[in-house]
């Protein structure tokens, strides 16, 4: 099978505002013009799709309007940002890349990025 290598960081810590960013890089065997990127979350052996986008090489990634993901592409790199994360969203986020066109079709799946999310402490009431 034509498996494509996909690299992503092992660990990322979300910001205090619940935003996590990481780079997903793929070793393209061909001259792809259309690429599909999917972010999967694995927790407790359950895998769910977080978001997905198809983009033309050289163009921006377009996620659905209500998506928690945004991203930009540069060559064979995709910069992904996931927003609105809370502590319960901590888990392994896997980058899946598909070269959709022209044929042949290629699929690559990264090893996953463990995203840690820590809910911010509530601000204490202040007496003045």
């Amino acid at each position: 099978c034509k498996a494509m290598h996909v690299a992503q960081p092992a660990v990322v810590l979300a910001s205090s505002r619940g935003i996590a960013s990481f780079v997903c890089e793929y070793a393209s065997p061909g001259k792809a013009t259309e690429v599909r990127v999917t972010v999967l979350r694995q927790a407790d052996s359950q895998v769910t799709e977080v978001c997905a986008a198809t983009y033309m090489m050289g163009n921006e990634l377009t996620f659905l309007d209500d998506s928690i993901c945004t991203g930009t592409s540069s060559g064979n790199q995709v910069n992904l940002t996931i927003q609105g994360l809370r502590a319960m969203d901590t888990g392994l986020y896997i980058c899946k890349v598909e070269l959709m066109y022209p044929p042949p079709y290629y699929l690559g799946i990264g090893n996953g990025t463990q995203i840690y999310v820590i809910d911010p402490e509530p601000c204490p009431d202040s007496d003045f």
Partner: antibody
Framework: EVQLLESGGGLVQPGGSLRLSCAAS????????MSWIRQAPGKGLEWVSG????????DFADSVKGRFTISRDNSKNTLYLQMNSLRAEDTAMYYC???????????????WGQGTLVTVSS | QSVLTQPPSASGTPGQRVTISCSGS????????VYWYQQLPGTAPKLLIY???NRPSGVPDRFSGSKSGTSASLAISGLRSEDEADYYC????????????FGGGTKLTVL
């Protein structure tokens, strides 16, 4: 049942136009790239054009470039081939085919329609 | 003229093993998978082999494919009369304007 059904072929004069359609059923059409392939009478298969699953990318054989356009309507599960400035050498059976994939495997053109005959003659 | 080269004809008797060759170059077969299609008389082509040697479900194991360098071959063992058809090889080509390339086809006759 996974199926492709072509229509729109017929007899047309040189210089004329035709629009072929390919109706897909039994699978998620918007997930697959598609191709048109033709076969002149008594001859072999010739790839004509291809289009990505979103419709954003297209390719054409040199023999039809500038004369044919490929498009798709994913809401109607239909693939199209607009053929302009037709020539006698475009006479052929035209097939649409799905570019299949499963898991890590590219499966080539795994589903074909029955074809529609285009005859260009005066 | 086709990008991939196949013999125009091949023949065999029932029960025999026949092989059909397909020759290409480094930009197609040399760097991509090969696919084989069977076209019975008066019908549309049907996928026979994908990814050099894989059979879709429903294709008998009498059909097998292989690839070496810039050439590929389709072997049919235990030849049957219903195998009489045209066989086409196909690959992808990174050097051409169109990504899909076919062989010229081989007419298999069962004697």
């Amino acid at each position: 049942e996974v199926q492709l059904l072509e229509s729109g072929g017929g007899l047309v004069q040189p210089g004329g136009s035709l629009r072929l359609s390919c109706a897909a059923s039994g699978f998620t059409f918007k997930a697959y790239s598609m191709s048109w392939i033709r076969q002149a009478p008594g001859k072999g298969l010739e790839w004509v054009s291809g289009i990505s699953n979103t419709g954003g990318s297209t390719d054409f054989a040199d023999s039809v470039k500038g004369r044919f356009t490929i498009s798709r309507d994913n809401s109607k599960n239909t693939l199209y081939l607009q053929m302009n400035s037709l020539r006698a050498e475009d006479t052929a059976m035209y097939y649409c085919a799905r570019l299949g994939y499963s898991g890590y495997d590219d499966r080539g053109m795994d589903v074909w329609g029955q074809g529609t005959l285009v005859t260009v003659s005066s | 003229q086709s990008v991939l080269t196949q013999p125009p004809s091949a023949s065999g008797t029932p029960g025999q093993r026949v092989t059909i060759s397909c020759s290409g170059s480094s930009s197609n077969i040399g760097s991509n998978y090969v696919y084989w299609y069977q076209q019975l008389p008066g019908t549309a082509p049907k996928l026979l082999i994908y990814g050099n040697s894989n059979r879709p479900s429903g294709v008998p194991d009498r059909f097998s494919g292989s690839k070496s360098g810039t050439s590929a071959s389709l072997a049919i063992s235990g030849l049957r009369s219903e195998d009489e058809a045209d066989y086409y090889c196909q690959s992808y080509d990174s050097s051409l304007s169109g990504p899909v390339v076919f062989g010229g086809g081989t007419k298999l006759t069962v004697l």
